[in-house]
């Protein structure tokens, strides 16, 4: 996926160095891995490991590669056509509502509830009431009320930082 594009994401303007490949735009657009020149005549390749573009575009600059935060692991590096993929470390997760940081998974469920879902890089453990089977959406329970569980194993990316 491409990263959302705002002013701070655009790589600083650099004149095309000799090693940067050029090609001609197609219908005014440049292919993934390139951006368009200021005069619109050339497609200039992004710089591997520094910036990227994922779609056909008329961007004046490629997008700056994301760096994974502490508390994240890099699943795949930035290429000219794909941003870095970062994932929360084991035992932590990132919610869609709070994508800024990885949060620690709960260690267990409240009394009277059972765990039906493990901690993953994109979700906390899931607890349901023993009798009704309804999900628990409360805060982290007090320690004496918990049934402990081990963190789940990492799977696919929780957040494509690009």
């Amino acid at each position: 996926e491409s990263a959302l594009i705002t002013q701070q994401d655009l790589a600083p303007q650099q004149r095309a160095a000799p090693q940067q490949k050029r090609s001609s735009p197609s219908e005014g657009l440049c292919p993934p891995g390139h951006h368009i020149s200021e005069d619109g005549r050339d497609c200039i390749s992004c710089k591997y490991g520094q910036d990227y573009s994922t779609h056909w575009n008329d961007l004046l600059f490629c997008l700056r590669c994301t760096r994974c935060d502490s508390g994240e692991v890099e699943l795949s590096p930035c290429t000219t056509t794909r941003n870095t993929v970062c994932q929360c470390e084991e035992g932590t997760f990132r919610e869609e509502d709070s994508p800024e940081m990885c949060r620690k998974c709960r260690t267990g469920c409240p009394r009277g509830m059972v765990k039906v879902g493990d901690c993953t890089p994109w979700s906390d453990i899931e607890c349901v009431h023993k009798e009704s089977g309804t999900k628990h959406s409360g805060e982290v329970p007090a320690v004496e009320e918990t049934v402990t569980s081990s963190p789940g194993t990492p799977a696919s990316p929780c957040s494509l930082s690009g």
Epitope: E1, L4, T6, L60
Partner: nanobody
Framework: QVQLQESGGGLVQAGGSLRLSCAAS????????MGWFRQAPGKEREFLAA????????YYADSVKGRFTASRDDAKSTAYLQMSRLRPEDTGIYYC??????????????????WGQGTQVTVSS
């Protein structure tokens, strides 16, 4: 909070053109990314185009490359999608989106923080 309102949809014959507008209110969106998705009947929402701040350029899906042009006027807090050479398969509800953080993927529906109500585009053959 950002409110988005699309307009400009309608019925058009294959080969024709339409221009969609998306007016944002609630706060300045000059440093936000804006984009366009569509949902065809019975299908998932599909990324079409993403417009960067200050007319710095746009991203396009392969399916609309060369036919659709995204633009924006930050002074008016409005984004536009100029659609030409329309095809029957372009029929669907067109949504304007805004995403607020640099880490959010704008080319996936999950990455959009704010959605408009959508405007219907029907392309007849």
């Amino acid at each position: 909070q950002v409110q988005l309102q699309e307009s400009g949809g309608g019925l058009v014959q294959a080969g024709g053109s339409l221009r969609l507008s998306c007016a944002a209110s609630g706060r300045s969106i000059s440093n936000y990314a804006m984009g366009w998705f569509r949902q065809a009947p019975g299908k998932e929402r599909e990324f079409l185009a993403a417009s960067v701040w200050n007319n710095g350029g746009n991203y396009y899906a392969d399916s609309v490359k060369g036919r659709f042009t995204a633009s924006r006027d930050d002074a008016k807090s409005t984004a536009y999608l100029q659609m030409s050479r329309l095809r029957p398969e372009d029929t669907g509800i067109y949504y304007c989106v805004v995403a607020r953080t640099p880490e959010t993927p704008i080319t996936s529906a999950r990455g959009a923080n704010y959605w408009g109500q959508g405007t219907q585009v029907t392309v007849s053959s």
